[in-house]
């Protein structure tokens, strides 16, 4: 609450997240012309990312393009992609949608379609849906430990959200334990308002919010954090302006001498941690 | 404008980047001794790196130490590291521009010169300017969608930069179109007095500030962005406080049973969008 | 200092760090079943991890699982994970302290004790303690070159920490040289208060603070930074919530075929800088 | 699905030549050959892509062999010459999406090179 007579400052603030939990994930794995039920482990090593400060990723989903090599193929047929006769492909033009550089030539996709031929990673990757369910939709149930240390310097005052007297085996809830900083990803969701299985398909950004609201006073002292979540993504984005939260990267490996490459596009939540508030002091 | 009567608060922000756009690369490569003109294709998962919040990176340029293992070679005879016998080399002395630690011995580098052996990951990493033209200077024509998300959580109004009646194909002109939030990397470095070109080669910083003066008051109420662009890093740095934004990383790799790496000295530029402004209320 | 007829505004700053150093590990290495001394060299794109924006990491220390594979396996004995008969396993159960998913079986861990099989990356991660010393403890003698732009968009005005007069060659000291922006890294630690050996064990977080307070009057002119440095982990942090700093990474391969990884478990000192300040003018 | 069919494959003296040839039953980007010795994994030996661009050798047969595309007849084939013991193979058509990637395969012609 405003206290007029307050000299007030604003919060300095340090966070340190660490993310458990395992994912089992089932999918059809096509190892020499055979589709066969592949089942995997993910744990944090394998789905988080790490050093992210005041943000965590947690990957949900992914699509992965395999055993790709720099070389020359027809591009994905996607909308309005496809060509009947070299004079729709542009030699070194660059479409924004496209994975790589048209060579000028209209050549065979498969039986039925021809697009033009591009210099890229091949094959290019297929602009096919995210899995639904997402693969790791079991992610709802790992759980994140918030560490976050305070400073007001102008009031040469430090302090932390994790008090000695705290049991490392609570759960964060809104009324039973509003001070434990354990979450439990989907619980963060339901706070929000949010469907965790449904955000898990396309991605998405949360945001945990610390308010630190500190009466340094030391006749009334108080500074504890309060914590509250929202999404920060827009679900209703329009198509073209990227909905959800995914990015792309690579493995690179050498095979027979020839450099080649894995893209995963990794959809999941990015957690923004929000820190804010201030203390005020006589 | 300063409203004296209102109560001001300062911004909550959240950032989401999407780069966009395909590099194609020309460059001398040796394979077998033998030195030809390689073309390679660059995409997002090539020369941009995850999940940076309020930063994003696209790397512009490159210089590669192939094949380096972990053994004993003379290191590399920059200025002032050349020797003559073994009293100028100190066992255990680890020189801060050098790669590795002094073993005591004064080796041949080549034909006419010696420097001090040393245990490093070998052959050293050759002290060459980085390419110029830049490898990926093309990149000047990529663009970056900006995703930004904004809260006054003492008002309890939040809102973002972009409103669903904008259209997805727009470039951000700072006349023509102010409120579009997909940015040209060229455009952003002219609008700052930059020359893309130039920085591309030694890498830099370049900063995308997004202002919000927000009038929350319902009767004349104002809350957009407004964009401007500044370069960060500092163009007549001295030498010695390492002039431009590179970085170091590596492709470890086993060949032969023999752990290897590549090493990448990538420059870039460092994109920093910093968001701040005010929310005021009667 | 307090000046009641200015208008403070808060510093919109920017960090770009830049790490130098080389540590030698020796480590006891296991090849085919002989355990001998291995000495290895780790520069920067070894211990280090790039693009961080207001925070960087240095590695000093790490536990290594080589040749993890996806498959079945007893997990690790750690304290009340032994069993005696498949009632102690859960068919699908994942323990948060474990690192896989039960199989319902209880199986030989070794000779003497027995635990419930995983599905899991395996063999599993032995839980042992972090080696003391630690590995990088060299990384005392590291150092870091920050660089900090700030600008007070309210007032028109733009500095840095680095001026021209500077010289590349100095070493922060808090009486001899408050101004350079060298830093050693135990020297970080000593103006702390902090054991730099003590903490490389188990990680930790060093904040490193740049406070700004400008007065932009032409008459009295001043904006310098001032550099503090405190601890932001807690070292007397309680077992159950992860005490030190250390993530998992994975460096993954395939071997015959098989897709294996190395897990490595990073120990180490992530270093947040906290710029902060006002900018005032009459 | 792609059927291939290979013809051409024979017994040849070291030093000789042999042409084989494939037709697919549909068009396709790329067209190649890939071989597999007794007891020895399938490796690729030469590939092509549309209209002969781009084309792609293993080291092993750079020289020596020559991979040539026939669009309107959905065909390739491979000239084989200056042959050694070691080209003796079972050699498969496959088709794909680029030089380097291939999904269908047809059942192998024999060749074998005597000494």
């Known amino acids: 609450s405003d206290k007029l007579y307050q000299r007030k400052e604003p919060v300095i603030s340090s966070v340190h997240t660490k993310v458990k939990g395992i994912a089992e994930v089932t999918e059809n794995v096509t190892e020499g012309g055979v589709t066969k039920l592949g089942h995997s482990i993910f744990d944090t090593a394998d789905y988080t990312f790490p050093l992210q400060g005041n943000s965590f990723f947690v990957m949900t989903n992914y699509v992965k393009s395999e055993g790709q090599v720099q070389t020359l193929c027809p591009e994905y047929p996607r909308r309005g992609a496809q060509c009947s006769s070299d004079r729709r492909c542009k030699k070194g033009w660059m479409d924004p949608q496209s994975k790589g550089i048209q060579t000028g030539r209209c050549v065979p996709y498969d039986k039925t379609r021809k697009t033009c031929e591009v210099s890229a990673w091949c094959p290019t990757e297929e602009e096919k849906e995210a899995p639904r369910p997402a693969l790791l939709r079991s992610a709802e149930n790992f759980t994140v430990l918030i560490k976050n240390n305070i400073h007001f310097p102008g009031h040469n005052y430090t302090t932390r959200n994790i008090l000695p007297t705290m049991n490392g085996s609570c759960t964060f809830h809104k009324t039973w334990d509003p001070q434990c900083s354990i979450f439990r990803l989907g619980d963060i969701f339901q706070e929000a308002g949010e469907n965790f299985t449904e955000v898990a398909v396309q991605g998405g950004i949360m945001g945990i919010e610390i308010y630190w609201d500190c009466n340094l006073d030391s006749w009334s002292h108080h500074c504890r954090p309060r914590y509250s979540f929202r999404r920060l993504d827009d679900k209703n984005m329009d198509e073209s302006f990227v909905p959800g939260y995914n990015f792309r990267y690579a493995k690179y490996y050498k095979e027979n001498n020839v450099e080649k490459r894995t893209l995963i596009k990794a959809f999941g939540i990015r957690f923004d941690i929000l820190v804010f508030g201030t203390g005020g002091k006589f | 404008s300063d409203k004296l009567y209102q109560r001001k608060e300062p911004v909550i922000s959240s950032v989401h980047t999407k780069v966009k756009g395909i590099a194609e690369v020309t460059e001398n490569v040796t394979e077998g001794g033998v030195t030809k003109l390689g073309h390679s294709i660059f995409d997002t998962a090539d020369y941009t790196f995850p999940l940076q919040g309020n930063s994003f990176f696209v790397m512009t340029n490159y210089v590669k130490s192939e094949g380096q293992v972990q053994t004993l070679c003379p290191e590399y005879p920059r200025r002032g590291a050349q020797c003559s016998s073994d009293r100028r080399c100190k066992k255990g002395w680890m020189d801060p521009q050098s790669k590795g630690i002094q073993t005591g011995r004064c080796v041949p580098y080549d034909k006419t010169r010696k420097t001090c052996e040393v245990s490093a990951w070998c052959p050293t990493e050759e002290e060459k300017e980085a390419p110029r033209p830049a490898l990926l200077r093309s990149a000047e024509n990529f663009t970056v969608l900006i995703k930004n998300n904004i809260h006054f959580p003492g008002h309890n109004y939040t809102t973002r930069n972009i409103l669903p009646t904008m259209n997805g194909s727009c470039t951000f002109h700072k006349t023509w179109d102010p409120q579009c939030s997909i940015f040209r990397l060229g455009d952003i470095f002219q609008e700052a007095g930059e020359n893309f070109t130039e920085v591309a080669v030694q890498g830099g910083i370049m900063g995308i500030e997004i202002y919000w003066d927000c009038n929350l008051d319902s009767w004349s109420h104002h809350c957009r962005p407004r964009y401007s662009f500044r370069r960060l890093d500092d163009k007549n740095m001295d030498e010695s406080f390492v002039p431009g934004y590179n970085f170091r990383y590596a492709k470890y790799y086993k060949e032969n049973n023999v752990e290897k790496r590549t090493l990448i000295k990538a420059f870039g530029i460092r994109f920093d969008i910093l968001v701040f402004g005010t929310g005021g209320k009667f | 200092s307090d000046k009641l007829y200015q208008r403070k505004e808060p510093v919109i700053s920017s960090v770009h760090t830049k790490v130098k150093g080389i540590a030698e590990v020796t480590e006891n290495v296991t090849e085919g079943g002989v355990t001998k001394l291995g000495h290895s060299i780790f520069d920067t794109a070894d211990y280090t991890f790039p693009l961080q924006g207001n925070s960087f990491f240095v590695m000093t220390n790490y536990v290594k699982s080589e040749g993890q594979v996806q498959t079945l396996c007893p997990e690790y004995p750690r304290r009340g994970a032994q069993c005696s008969s498949d009632r102690r396993c859960k068919k699908g159960w994942m323990d948060p302290q474990s690192k896989g998913i039960q199989t319902g079986r209880c199986v030989p861990y070794d000779k003497t004790r027995k635990t419930c099989e995983v599905s899991a990356w395996c063999p599993t991660e032995e839980e042992k303690e972090a080696p003391r010393p630690a590995l990088l403890r060299s990384a005392e003698n590291f150092t870091v070159l920050i660089k900090n732009n700030i600008h007070f968009p309210g007032h028109n005005y733009t500095t840095r920490n680095i001026l021209p007069t500077m010289n590349g060659s100095c070493t922060f000291h808090k009486t001899w040289d408050p101004q350079c922006s060298i830093f050693r890294l135990g020297d970080i630690f000593q103006e702390a208060g902090e054991n730099f050996t003590e903490v490389a064990v188990q990680g930790g977080i060093m904040g490193i603070e740049i406070y700004w307070d400008c007065n932009l009057d032409s008459w009295s002119h001043h904006c310098r930074p001032r550099y503090s440095f405190r601890r932001l982990d807690d070292k007397n942090m309680d077992e159950s919530f992860v005490p030190g700093y250390n993530f998992r990474y994975a460096k993954y391969y395939k071997e015959n075929n098989v897709e294996k990884r190395t897990l490595i478990k990073a120990f180490g000192i992530r270093f947040d800088i906290l710029v902060f300040g006002t900018g005032g003018k009459f | 699905e792609v059927q291939l069919v290979e013809s051409g494959g024979g017994l040849v003296q070291a030093g000789g030549s042999l042409r084989l040839s494939c037709a697919a039953s549909e068009r396709t980007y790329s067209m190649g050959w890939f071989r597999q010795a007794p007891g020895k994994e399938r490796e690729f030996v030469a590939g092509s892509g549309w209209d002969g661009i781009p084309t792609r050798y293993a080291d092993s047969v750079k020289g020596r062999f020559t991979i040539s595309r026939d669009n309107a007849k959905n065909a390739v084939s491979l000239q084989m010459s200056g042959l050694k013991p070691e080209d003796t193979a079972i050699y498969y058509c496959?088709?794909?999406?680029?030089?380097?990637?291939?999904?269908?395969w047809g059942q192998g012609t024999q060749v074998t090179v005597s000494s």
């Open positions: 496959a088709t794909g999406t680029s030089v380097y990637h291939y999904q269908y």
